[in-house]
């Protein structure tokens, strides 16, 4: 229903705390360089204005759209052009073009320093002094680094953060209480970020239909007892929620997500038997819980998929009558039978089925043509299954760090033109798939591995889009989202690449490396590994292992030496010489 004042409506629905949090996230995602204080001031002004509209919906400007209100606020910021360059040109446009312009200027890789966590004592002091400001800083810092972070979910992570601090800051050993818990939240939030970015990419590049297909597959796997009409309703609602968040309409998004959670909890009987635990929780926890609820038990009496989609006499008529509905029912029926497949794989199968009907239904004898379609799915299913087996075997053999290195070598050979920091980031993220997925039960591995890899590769594509340097990467990134992972997997050594010349300074290290945290040490070593591969793209695994073992030994020796600086300056050049010889 239409409301006289959109801002009053959202303020009333969301409540002051969530309203302010979402407005802060929105501003931080649009203007990523502004300080917390600048944004906090704007948020307060918007909140005060919303309250006047709640008191009187007919007050001046209360009838304006949220985009108009927020856009006007952003455009009133002093020194916009000096700080943001051509983004300031957006302010010359009218809505909705202005908002579209802001969206186009969101930066997936802003040049901001890594978000450093203060030490425990300092963190607890500032948290106790002003929990609201502390949480505001958290929302601001995460949102500006992740401009597509799913806003209502970020509120959930802030709430988690709050609970951890409340608990741990009361403990004697704050550090050992906080570190593992906050690390856990950080890891989950980073995964959430890349997954949501993938959803927004799907929406931006391929439209609502593509996202809705993803949602139908995912929901059908989770709720195999829900009928097609129920799944379609949930997929339509979920598509609307994600469209709003991806489009920067964060208040609407959070409000509609709350509505969807309410609907699901009121209709558990027709959706799933597994929702009750989630539905007993407060709003943010409830919505989060529903988004990752375990799969319901599959109905025991499902007929073979072939009955309706191959053997039925009216396959082509049903397809002709309503293509999207027929393909949707195929995706639904196939997905509910296969919680053990990735959504990407299910969408590839649906695409194959669609292509088969397009071809076969135009022939004189369609049934003879499409009769083998399910058998033709086999190679499509085997490929990701083999990928999972090979990679999990390798992970189990090498451990996470070794597995990341193996991936780093592989991907540097596939796309040596890509910048080393991007390759290292991608390989580290791709390598985490082992820890995340390979320890799961067999039937959960494939969906975990492939859907996670797809999300990470989407980030690789986004970063590469900014500065395209590799034809291999461009080729894989310009295809459909579901084909990207198989495309990257199939890439081999880039034969067109002219190896980098060997520069001694690239492999020269100093004693400061010894005091770095383990993660930073690993990144330094992985940076060197990528540079070695760029120098010798066809180096064997054995050669690279020899060099990396030597390198690790060198670091270990010099970091234990009494005079570290002398050790690095005398042993370093010897290491460089040995490396050159080993790779010759």
């Amino acid at each position: 229903e239409a409301h006289k004042s959109e801002i009053a409506h959202r303020y009333n629905d969301l409540g002051e705390q969530h309203f302010k949090g979402l407005v802060l996230i929105a501003f931080s995602q649009y203007l990523q360089k502004c300080s917390y204080d600048e944004h906090a001031k704007l948020v307060q002004e918007v909140t005060d204005f919303a309250k006047t509209c709640v008191a009187d919906e007919s007050a001046a400007n209360c009838d304006k759209s949220l985009h108009t209100l927020f856009g006007d606020k952003l455009c009133a910021i002093p020194n916009l052009r000096e700080n943001y360059g051509e983004l300031a040109d957006c302010c010359t446009k009218q809505e909705p073009e202005r908002n579209e312009c802001f969206l186009q200027h969101k930066d997936d890789n802003p040049s901001l320093p890594p978000f450093e966590r203060p030490e425990a004592e300092a963190m607890c002091t500032s948290f106790k002094e002003n929990p609201t400001t502390f949480m505001g800083h958290y929302l601001h810092e995460v949102a500006r680094r992740h401009p597509y972070f799913y806003a209502p979910e970020l509120l959930y992570y802030a709430e988690q953060y709050n609970e951890i601090l409340t608990q741990c800051c009361a403990e004697a050993d704050k550090e050992s209480c906080l570190t593992p818990k906050l690390d856990g939240v950080k890891e989950k939030a980073l995964v959430s970020s890349v997954r949501q970015r993938m959803k927004c990419s799907s929406m931006q590049k391929f439209g609502e239909r593509a996202f809705k297909a993803w949602a139908v597959a995912r929901l059908s796997q989770t709720f195999p007892n829900a009928d097609f009409a129920e799944i379609t309703k949930l997929a339509t609602d979920l598509t609307k929620v994600n469209k709003e968040c991806c489009h920067g309409d964060l208040l609407e998004c959070a409000d509609d997500r709350a509505e969807l959670a309410k609907y699901m909890c009121e209709n558990q009987a027709t959706i799933s038997s597994k929702l009750q635990t989630c539905c007993d929780k407060p709003l943010l926890k409830k919505a989060h819980c529903l988004s990752e609820v375990e799969h319901d038990t599959m109905p025991a009496d499902l007929p073979a998929i072939a009955a309706d989609f191959v053997e039925d006499q009216e396959v082509c008529k049903n397809y002709a009558e309503a293509k999207d509905v027929f393909l949707g029912t195929f995706l639904y029926e196939y997905s509910r039978r296969h919680p053990d497949y990735s959504v990407s794989l299910l969408l590839r199968l649906a695409k194959k089925y669609e292509a088969t009907l397009e071809k076969c239904c135009a022939e004189a004898n369609p049934p003879a043509c499409y009769g083998t379609v399910l058998a033709e799915f086999q190679p499509l299913v085997e490929e990701p299954k083999n990928l999972v087996k090979t990679n999990c075997d390798l992970y189990e053999k090498l451990g996470e760090y070794g597995f990341q290195n193996a991936i780093l070598v592989r991907y540097t050979q596939k796309a040596p033109q890509v910048s080393t920091p991007t390759l290292v980031e991608a390989a580290r993220n791709l390598g985490r798939v082992g820890t995340k997925c390979c320890t799961l039960p067999e039937d959960q591995r494939l969906p975990c591995v492939e859907d996670y890899l797809s999300a990470i590769l989407n980030r690789v594509c986004l970063l590469h889009e900014k500065t395209p340097v590799s034809e291999h990467v461009t080729k894989c990134c310009s295809g459909s989202l579901v084909e990207r992972r198989p495309c990257f997997s199939a890439l081999t050594v880039d034969e067109t690449y002219v190896p980098k010349e060997f520069k001694a300074e690239t492999f020269t290290f100093h004693s400061d490396i010894c005091t770095l945290p383990e993660k930073e040490k690993q990144i330094k070593k992985q940076t060197a590994l990528a540079e070695l591969v760029k120098h010798k793209p066809k180096a064997t695994a054995e050669q690279l292992k020899t060099v990396m073992d030597d390198f690790a030994q060198f670091l270990d020796t010099c970091c234990k030496a009494a005079d570290k600086d002398t050790c690095f300056s005398t042993e370093g050049p010897n290491l460089v010489t040995r490396c050159k010889d080993a790779l010759a």
Partner: nanobody, 115 residues
Framework: KVQLVESGGGLVQPGNSLRLSCAAS????????MSWVRQAPGKGLEWVSS????????LTADSVKGRFTISRDNSKNTLYLQMNSLRAEDTAVYYC????????SSQGTLVTVSS
């Protein structure tokens, strides 16, 4: 909504000819193979002939081969069945179907061959 409407049936003497038409709507006609099937009184459905979406490929049952010809006009969204040298055993209700289906989803047109 897919609609198929057959016409052209009637009473005809053995040895004579008839031309059946099927007007199609509600879908991209040229993207789908089409068929004619028939049902004689008291019998099951029998496949008669099929044609590809482009009209380049046709298939015809042995029982009518050399006598019946299937064709289509994609610009008019219409399927045809030219029936020559009709026999008493060709008496049936004729239906057009999408994609080789042996399921009636239209009214059909009655062809009676009798002297």
């Amino acid at each position: 909504k897919v609609q198929l409407v057959e016409s052209g049936g009637g009473l005809v003497q053995p040895g004579n000819s008839l031309r059946l038409s099927c007007a199609a709507s509600g879908f991209t006609f040229s993207s789908f193979g089409m068929s004619w099937v028939r049902q004689a009184p008291g019998k099951g459905l029998e496949w008669v002939s099929s044609i590809s979406g482009s009209g380049s490929d046709t298939l015809t049952a042995d029982s009518v081969k050399g006598r019946f010809t299937i064709s289509r006009d994609n610009s008019k969204n219409t399927l045809y069945l030219q029936m020559n040298s009709l026999r008493a055993e060709d008496t049936a209700v004729y239906y057009c179907t999408i994609g080789g289906s042996l399921v009636r989803s239209s009214q059909g047109t009655l062809v009676t061959v009798s002297s």
